[in-house]
């Protein structure tokens, strides 16, 4: 089904429009930002693998404005946002957009600039304080040092806004100094360092699980006293809106 244009009169029923694609399914309150390195340190074929990883991750998230909101940004010497946190589109449409992110193949991919963009554009206003805020920084290159002058300031600024930064270093040219710096800023800023894009698939479930464990479950819906005893027969609501308490993943 094609997506209807979003307007104030469009009623978009989220959460029951698309069933989960995997057993592994994160049903938490989370704002998740994917930052994709658009430098020539990744070949076009490797960039396709990187995008496939992002799409695979998105398949394991309960994407909606109520649960997991996602943003996707490709960065080079600037930043190009393909998906914003407030974009009201079906998960399948968001995955399609993520799969069509263009390969820039630029000489430089500035982590400082994209973290600045994340700090001042994506998380300029915190409109969902109850949700966890996580930035997944997929980095395969090193920006020139002169561009990194304010790098730590941006990482600290994100920390002040309670944005967790998870760097994923890919390949031999990833900036390990910056990765270690990010880790040093907050205990939740766990890094994943991979030797190539081929390891992304192996690490995917661990990364999704780690992200999901950092996010809170939604509080149970509060019912008025006269409705407290009402029960609904099995299967009537389709996909459950609440995952089991014991684990971050809806199995």
């Amino acid at each position: 089904p094609t997506d209807a244009p979003v307007s104030p009169t469009t009623l978009y029923v989220e959460d029951i429009s698309e069933p989960p694609l995997h057993d592994f399914y994160c049903s938490r309150l989370l704002d998740l930002v994917f930052l994709l390195d658009g430098s020539s340190r990744l070949s076009e074929a490797e960039f396709e693998v990187l995008k496939a990883f992002v799409v695979d991750m998105m398949e394991r998230l309960r994407i909606s404005q109520k649960w997991v909101r996602v943003a996707v940004v490709e960065y080079h010497d600037g930043s190009h946002a393909y998906i914003g946190l407030k974009d009201r589109k079906r998960p399948s449409e968001l995955r399609r957009i993520a799969s069509q992110v263009k390969y820039a193949g630029s000489q430089v991919a500035s982590t400082s600039e994209v973290l600045k963009y994340t700090l001042f554009q994506i998380f300029s206003k915190i409109d969902r304080p109850e949700a966890s805020r996580i930035t997944l920084l997929l980095m395969a290159s090193q920006e020139p040092q002169r561009m990194s002058r304010n790098f730590v300031r941006y990482v600290q600024g994100l920390k002040k806004k309670k944005v967790i930064v998870i760097p994923v270093g890919i390949g031999p040219h990833a900036n390990l100094k910056q990765i270690r710096l990010i880790e040093k800023q907050a205990p939740e800023n766990k890094a994943f360092v991979l030797s190539s894009v081929d390891e992304l698939e192996q690490q995917r479930d661990e990364i999704v699980s780690y992200l999901c464990d950092l996010a809170p479950e939604a509080p149970p819906p509060t019912l008025p006293p006269d409705m407290a005893q009402v029960t609904v027969g099995p299967g009537l609501l389709g996909v459950s809106t609440l995952g089991p308490k014991r684990n971050s993943m809806v199995l």
Partner: antibody, heavy 122, light 107 residues
Framework: QVQLKESGPGLVAPSQSLSITCTVS????????VDWVRQPPGKGLEWLGM???????DYNSALKSRLSITKDNSKSQVFLKMNSLQTDDTARYYC????????????????WGQGTSVTVSS | DIQMTQSPSSLSASLGDRVTISCSAS??????LNWYQQKPDGAVKLLIF???SLHSGVPSRFSGSGSGTDYSLTISNLEPEDIATYYC?????????FGGGTKLEVK
């Protein structure tokens, strides 16, 4: 220990270019940045620009069009070149170590050379 | 560019005195401020970085404080070797800029 030593021409004619060499010891130019600062006679300090460990550069925008900073890591030397000199470029020129790095963001100029005096006069 | 204004421009004090030099920035510099000492022979040394952190080898009688646009350097017990000109410098934004200097003399 950390040392920086500038060597320059002393006297330069107006409209000519200035070349100063800074030779360093006690640290590697791949690990630290080097800045250039000047001080006209009886006046304050003015930051000119810097070269980072990876060779990337930053310049004072007021001087950028006539300034160039380069280096030779193997010789532990940093070079300042300034074109189209005028009399108000007369100053003592200092090269200074800068611990600027991905891991450092307190850009303090921590060790200074003794400076070399340059007079622009015909 | 960020303008840095130091006061006073010159100062006469007695040995053992407590001396304070002020530095004001034209905009908030978020504590990104250093202090330097220049001896009469032209030799320059870093004293304090990031407003209040003492550089290695600098005597503890030197201290720095401040925030926003207003900063100060204090010498708690003036010694003969402290006779020099003192400069503040901001590193909030390029280009780095220095104050005009404060020349410290002994009465």
């Amino acid at each position: 220990q950390v040392q920086l030593k500038e060597s320059g021409p002393g006297l330069v004619a107006p409209s000519q270019s200035l070349s100063i060499t800074c030779t360093v010891s006690g640290f590697s130019l791949t690990d630290y940045g080097v800045d250039w600062v000047r001080q006209p006679p009886g006046k304050g300090l003015e930051w000119l620009g810097m070269i980072w460990g990876d060779g990337s550069t930053d310049y004072n925008s007021a001087l950028k069009s006539r300034l160039s900073i380069t280096k030779d890591n193997s010789k532990s030397q940093v070079f300042l070149k300034m074109n189209s000199l005028q009399t108000d470029d007369t100053a003592r020129y200092y090269c200074v170590r800068d611990p600027a790095d991905y891991g450092n963001y307190d850009y303090a100029l921590d060790y200074w050379g003794q400076g070399t005096s340059v007079t622009v006069s015909s | 560019d960020i303008q840095m204004t130091q006061s006073p421009s010159s100062l006469s004090a007695s040995l053992g005195d407590r001396v304070t030099i002020s530095c004001s920035a034209s905009q908030d510099i978020n504590k990104y401020l250093n202090w330097y000492q220049q001896k009469p022979d032209g030799a320059v040394k870093l004293l304090i970085f990031y407003t209040s952190s003492l550089h290695s080898g600098v005597p503890s009688r030197f201290s720095g404080s401040g925030s926003g646009t207003d900063y100060s350097l204090t010498i708690s017990n003036l010694e003969p070797e402290d006779i020099a000109t003192y400069y503040c410098q901001q590193y909030e934004k390029l280009p780095w800029t220095f104050g005009g200097g404060t020349k410290l003399e002994v009465k």
